[in-house]
């Protein structure tokens, strides 16, 4: 009779076993083991027994021990099961941005691994269990389906295998897959609000602002504005689901033209785009041209407005004629006409808007010294000792210097308030003197003596 | 560390039996799987084996002097005693006792320094 | 009963490969062992279950086992490798000692 002990082995791929091979026999003629694993035969006192280290033992086996009494020969079994844990334990790979609403299928993928029937495995999102089922098939796929939450939003989904060796005096071996952090995200159908100027001067700054609301999370969305090539570099404020991004946006002579304004939300694996057309123009202002600026009396005097080729004038509010970018006037200088203001108004239509540019130039008329009647009278008749101030304005462009002499030296105090008295009378000489030359008025006083009652 | 010696008589007469004593120490025989065993070496001649045993006191013997050896060991003396009756001249060899770390491997890692046992009239 | 024959003798060059055999029935189902004699000394384990080398022993002692056959393989041999060798093995209940090789370097 030949027995075996242990009749059963659960072991680690690629470890190593002692067998037994007994016989009840005391002289066997043949006491061995048959096996396909390398083995040795250790030392044993007696030869009724033999042991057998059996090693590198990577799958299940049946060692057979035999023995031939003299009542025959017989053998016996032992089972050998070799167990390992699964060398991969993998969820198969998903985007990690996941919009919410969406049905997202977790697939856990198992290679290798034994005893299968021991074997399960377990989809988790954090330690909650989703999914268990055993181990089937090379590789095991277990897959679940999860629809997709907001406060899924950073929850890690796992995969996870249990090796379940307790019944056999082991322990339960577990492996687990990396983890598949899920980010959730809301990105509404609307495309973004842009707001910006439809027309930009050239070497002028205009702000830009995008917004859109209903998004999660709204720290991740990565706002994106240009200008053309221009990269715009926004401001982002950000609410409980929504953002405003303002840009500060500076245009060249380069960028004359129509120009694409882009403001893309991208958020997760998705984004929202709006165009915006900005036309970029150059319009100086209108050039107001006189002949000369200061001129005189009775000179002609041409006034010229020229503005942008495509703009059309009105010089002191009269069109050109025709209607275009250049309009001039004639006249001839008058003192009136000193100061006086010509302002040219251009208008420049840019993608359907008007655009309205001024200038202005003033002439200046040099005439005179005048001395006349109205603001210089010939004639005062004062009583004595009263308060009088004398009053002689002189005109003139430039302003003339004015002296009022009585025999050459007495002077009269003009626009001085003086008491009158016996010597103020008499006949004083009015001298007006500017470049333009001079003049002279005489003028009057008379003192009125008080009556004596 | 691990030392094993060999005591017994230099001299034995044929017929006459020889006892001889292993004292070992760094080591116990009380722990599983250890043993010691007994090798003999006449004057320029090979290695010949002779006997064991072990921590669960397990003998062992060579088929060829089976009859003629006895061992035996004293676990709380630290000692294993071989005895072998019947000395011939040919018997003349050095013992050496050395212990067997995994007696089931059957391999020997520390010997004694060996004694010279002469058998003669 | 199991047997174990060795060589006689053997002869290496120093620094090259020294190979001694060890033949006996099956003798690769079964741990070997070798062990290394000077004269007036006992003998020195240097290798065994077929492979292994105590601490303290040089690198360049290395065994195998298979099939018939041990063999003990000295490489780049020294002078002080200069020795008797035994091969050892066991058939239940016994241990078995080969007859011995001795090595010379020349």
């Known amino acids: 009779q030949t027995s075996v002990s242990p009749s059963k082995v659960i072991l680690p791929r690629g470890g190593s076993v002692l067998v037994t091979c007994s016989t009840s026999c005391d002289q066997p003629k043949l006491l061995g083991i048959e096996t396909p694993l390398p083995k040795k035969e250790l030392l044993l006192p007696g030869n009724n027994r033999k042991v057998y280290e059996l090693s590198n033992v990577q799958e299940d086996s049946q060692p057979m021990c035999y023995s031939n009494c003299p009542d025959g020969q017989s053998t016996a079994k032992t089972f050998l099961t070799v167990y390992w844990t699964p060398e991969r334990v993998e969820l198969a790979p998903l985007p990690s941005w996941q919009p919410v609403g969406k049905n997202l299928t977790l697939r856990c993928q198992v290679e290798g691994g034994a005893p299968r029937a021991n074997l399960t495995v377990v989809l988790l999102r954090g330690e909650k269990e989703l999914k268990r089922e055993p181990a089937v098939g090379e590789p095991a796929e277990v897959t679940t389906t999860v629809l997709v939450r907001r406060d899924h939003h950073g929850a890690n989904f796992s995969c996870r295998t249990e090796l379940d060796l307790r019944p056999q005096g082991l322990e339960l071996f577990e492996n687990t897959s990396a983890p598949y952090q899920l980010q959730t995200f809301v990105l509404p159908a609307t495309p973004p609000q842009l707001v910006s100027p439809r027309v930009l001067e050239v070497d002028t700054q205009g702000t830009v602002v995008c917004s859109l609301d209903g998004l999660f999370p709204v720290s991740e969305a990565q706002v994106h504005l240009a200008l053309g090539d221009q990269r715009l570099n926004p401001t982002v404020t950000y609410g409980n689901d929504s953002f405003s991004a303002k840009a500060s946006v500076s245009v060249t002579a380069e960028d004359e033209g129509t120009q694409r304004l882009t403001c893309a939300v991208i958020l997760g694996n998705q984004s929202q785009e709006t165009l915006q057309t900005v036309t970029i123009y150059s319009f100086p202002a209108p050039n107001v041209i006189l002949t000369k600026p200061e001129v005189s009396e009775g000179t002609e005097v041409t006034v010229k407005c020229e503005a942008h080729p495509r703009a059309k004038v009105t010089l002191n509010g009269v069109p050109a004629q025709p209607l275009g970018p250049r309009a001039q006037l004639l006249l001839k200088a008058t003192p009136e006409d000193n100061g006086r203001s010509f302002s040219c108004s251009a208008t420049l239509e840019v993608a359907g808007q008007l655009i309205h540019k001024n200038q202005t130039r003033e002439l200046r008329v040099l005439y005179g010294p005048r001395l006349d009647e109205r603001d210089c009278p010939g004639n005062w008749t004062w009583p004595e000792n009263s308060q009088q101030t004398p009053m002689c304005q002189a005109w003139g462009n430039p302003l003339p210097e004015l002296k009022c002499l009585k025999d050459g030296t007495f002077p009269l105090p003009i626009g001085e308030s003086v008491t009158v008295t016996r010597d103020l009378e008499g006949t004083y000489l009015c001298r007006a003197r500017s470049t333009q030359g001079e003049v002279t008025r005489k003028v009057t006083v008379n003192v009125l003596s008080p009556r004596y009652e | 560390q691990v030392q094993l010696k060999e005591s017994g008589p230099a001299l034995v007469k044929p017929t006459q039996t020889l006892t001889l004593t292993c004292t070992f120490s760094g080591f116990s025989l009380s722990t599983s799987g250890v043993g010691v065993g007994w090798i003999r070496q006449p004057p320029g001649k090979a290695l010949e084996w002779l006997a064991l045993i072990d921590w669960d006191d397990d003998k062992y013997y060579s088929t060829s002097l089976k009859t003629r050896l006895t061992i035996s060991k004293d676990t709380s003396k630290n000692q294993v005693v071989l005895t072998m009756t019947n000395m011939d001249p040919v018997d003349t060899a050095t013992y050496y006792c050395?212990?067997?770390?995994?007696?089931?491997?059957?391999?020997?890692?520390?010997w004694g320094q060996g004694t010279l046992v002469t058998v003669s009239s | 009963d199991i047997e174990l024959t060795q060589p006689p003798s053997v002869s290496v060059a120093p620094g090259q490969t020294a190979r001694i055999s060890c033949s006996g029935d099956a003798l690769g189902d079964k741990y070997a062992s070798w062990y290394q004699q000077k004269p007036g000394q006992a003998p020195v384990l240097v290798i065994y279950?077929?492979?292994d080398r105590p601490s303290g022993i040089p690198e360049r002692f290395s065994g195998s086992n298979s099939g018939n056959t041990a063999t003990l393989t000295i490489s780049g041999t020294q002078a002080e490798d200069e020795a008797d060798y035994y091969c050892?093995?066991?058939?239940?209940?016994?241990?078995?000692f080969g007859g011995g090789t001795k090595l010379t370097v020349l």
């Open positions: 050395a212990r067997y770390p995994v007696t089931q491997r059957s391999y020997m890692d520390v």
């Open positions: 050892q093995s066991y058939d239940s209940p016994q241990v078995v």
């Open positions: 279950d077929d492979s």
